[in-house]
Interface confidence: low
């Protein structure tokens, strides 16, 4: 009679995490008498998965009735598969011995690979803001997927980006994998409302990719433009000078008026006008009592935006000859009036 063969028909089985895996094994003969065992891995460090003779294996069920006479099918099913279950499973026939059973023959093994979904991608941006025309980096991370094959794409406002570098770790075989990608994005003035998207496609996602997003509003600083102008006189001895602070982001802004280099007033922007592109505008007024000045006045609007170095714009206010002549009689009681709309 031919010697017993242990046949494991599948070379590999791929199962989604959470499902059951069927590992097939059959003997060609009933002889010699003795139990079968399933192991994960080979050699001295192999892990016992199932022992026909004894033990408690709650996740393992046999596909056929092993106690049935003439049974040759020793296939098993392992429930609730996780990536940690991946590996090569061997069906091993033992010969009955005294005092211990002796290993007789092993099957060729079945490699179990687990399809596990990647975690939701987490996108993070730069630690400090940058100004338009500068390049900032965004990172995208996802973990716990298997198999290793994965596709990652970056988009900015729906347009695919090409300047990125992606790594899948580890490089060798593993129960599950992680992906890390860094995209470089050149900022433009209109990026306050922009969004970068990291899109991950994997066989476990059934064609529906996972997406992680980051808002460029967290990464961009648009410095303001300043314009100082004199408005029409409201009274003969009053000049109304405005400082128009335009197209800045984020909101944080402090404005200081200087009269001939001396601080007149400092205020923090509160009621801002938001532009369509997400940047803000703000206007500050300064009412100057021209009677209080004999000579021309240099008015400076100084703006400190988002903790950056201050920028300023000056305006030379000309005092008419008539006011200069009469100026000595005027007291300086109200050289400054509070900001008020025109």
């Amino acid at each position: 009679e031919d010697e017993l063969q242990v046949i494991q028909p599948e070379k590999s089985v791929s199962v989604a995490a959470g499902e059951s895996a069927t590992l097939r094994c059959a003997m060609t003969s009933l002889i010699p008498v003795g139990p079968i065992m399933w192991f994960r891995g080979a050699g001295a460090g192999r892990e016992l998965i199932y022992n026909q003779k004894e033990g408690h294996f709650p996740r393992v069920t046999t596909v056929s009735e092993l106690t049935k006479r003439n049974n040759l099918d020793f296939s098993i099913s392992i429930s609730n598969i996780t990536p940690a279950d991946a590996g090569t499973y061997y069906c091993v026939k033992f010969r009955k011995g005294s005092p211990d059973d002796v290993e007789f023959k092993s099957g060729a093994g079945t490699e179990l690979s687990v399809r596990a979904k990647p975690s939701a991608p987490v996108v993070s941006g730069p630690a400090v803001r940058a100004t338009p025309e500068h390049t900032v980096s965004f990172t995208c991370e996802s973990h716990g997927f298997s198999p290793r094959d994965i596709t990652l794409k970056w988009f900015k406002n729906g347009n695919e980006l090409s300047d990125f570098q992606t790594n899948v770790d580890p490089a060798g075989d593993s129960v599950s994998y992680s992906i890390h990608s860094t995209a470089r994005v050149v900022l433009t003035r209109g990026d306050v409302h922009s969004q970068v998207i990291c899109e991950i496609a994997h066989i476990t996602l059934q064609g529906d990719p996972l997406r992680g997003t980051a808002n460029l509003s967290e990464a961009i600083r648009v410095p303001p433009t300043l314009e100082v102008t004199q408005q029409p006189m409201r009274a003969e001895n009053q000049a109304n000078v405005t400082c128009q602070v335009s197209n800045f982001y984020p909101r944080g802004l402090q404005l200081t008026w200087l009269e001939n280099g001396n601080v007149s007033r400092t205020e923090t922007a509160s009621t801002l006008i938001e532009n369509k592109d997400g940047t803000y505008n703000w206007m500050s007024w300064l009412l100057v009592n021209t009677c209080a000045h004999r000579d021309d006045v240099v008015l400076t609007c100084q703006v400190e935006h988002d903790g950056q170095q201050a920028v300023s714009k000056s305006y030379a206010l000309e005092i008419s000859a008539h006011q200069k002549e009469h100026g000595s009689d005027i007291t300086h009681e109200a050289a400054l009036a509070p900001t008020a709309p025109l």
Partner: antibody
Framework: QVQLQQPRAELVKPGASVMLSCKAS????????IHWVRQGPGQGLEWIGL????????DCSETFKNKATLTVDTSSSTAYMQLSSLASEDSAVYYC????????????WGQGTLVTVSA | DVVMTQTPLTLSVTIGQPASISCKSS???????????LNWLLQRPGQSPKRLIY???KLDSGVPDRFTGSGSGTDFTLKISRVEAEDLGVYYC?????????FGGGTKLEIK
């Protein structure tokens, strides 16, 4: 644009093997799964299997596990399917198709190769 | 494998008239993420299949709005409100929720 080019026809003798090709262009070949689909004469469509060009990992439906072998050559952006031990019932049109990153599975198709098995 | 059953086998329609094709699956096609992966393809004579509809009801770009897809679970329908000459060919439903992907047997649309 995405294109998958397949030879129009192959004539094969019974018992022989044939290697079908699918040359991809217009996208990054190594990033997307390639599927193979069969259509018998006057019949419907049948999924054969898929391969990921980046790793060469394949999976075939049970029906084709002993019939089809899927491989890729990334240097030429070409996917191949070898059909072995051909019989007259293997005469069919064999299509390759590409999956995308979003909902676009089975959007891009090759024009198909008609395989005729005849003595 | 999930079995996809299409009816009718052949549909003969006058131009300008409506048409309806049914597709039933042996298992629910609702995936754990709440989406249903059912596509409709059209294979015109002598051509490769072309996708018309994905995720049950979403039309591919360039597909006329006379095509509508509907259904859920295991029952799906493709409707053409007014058939035109260019609509003739074989229509297939295909599921992508369960591995492996499986196709319906096809419905041949003929013009009367």
């Amino acid at each position: 644009q995405v294109q998958l080019q397949q030879p129009r026809a192959e004539l094969v003798k019974p018992g022989a093997s044939v290697m079908l090709s699918c040359k991809a262009s217009g996208y990054t070949f190594s990033s997307y799964w390639i599927h193979w689909v069969r259509q018998g004469p006057g019949q419907g469509l049948e999924w054969i299997g898929l391969i990921h060009p980046n790793s060469g990992n394949t999976d075939c439906s049970e029906t084709f596990k002993n019939k089809a072998t899927l491989t890729v050559d990334t240097s030429s952006s070409t996917a191949y399917m070898q059909l072995s031990s051909l019989a007259s019932e293997d005469s069919a049109v064999y299509y390759c198709a590409r999956d995308g990153a979003s909902y676009d599975w089975f959007v891009h198709w090759g024009q198909g190769t008609l395989v005729t098995v005849s003595a | 494998d999930v079995v996809m059953t299409q009816t009718p086998l052949t549909l003969s329609v006058t131009i300008g008239q409506p048409a309806s094709i049914s597709c039933k699956s042996s298992q629910s096609l609702l995936y754990t993420n709440g989406k249903t992966y059912l596509n409709w393809l059209l294979q015109r004579p002598g051509q490769s299949p072309k996708r018309l509809i994905y995720l049950v009801s979403k039309l591919d770009s360039g597909v006329p709005d006379r095509f509508t897809g509907s259904g859920s679970g295991t029952d799906f329908t493709l409707k053409i409100s007014r058939v035109e000459a260019e609509d003739l060919g074989v229509y297939y439903c295909v599921q992508g929720t369960h591995f492996p992907r499986t196709f319906g047997g096809g419905t041949k649309l003929e013009i009367k």
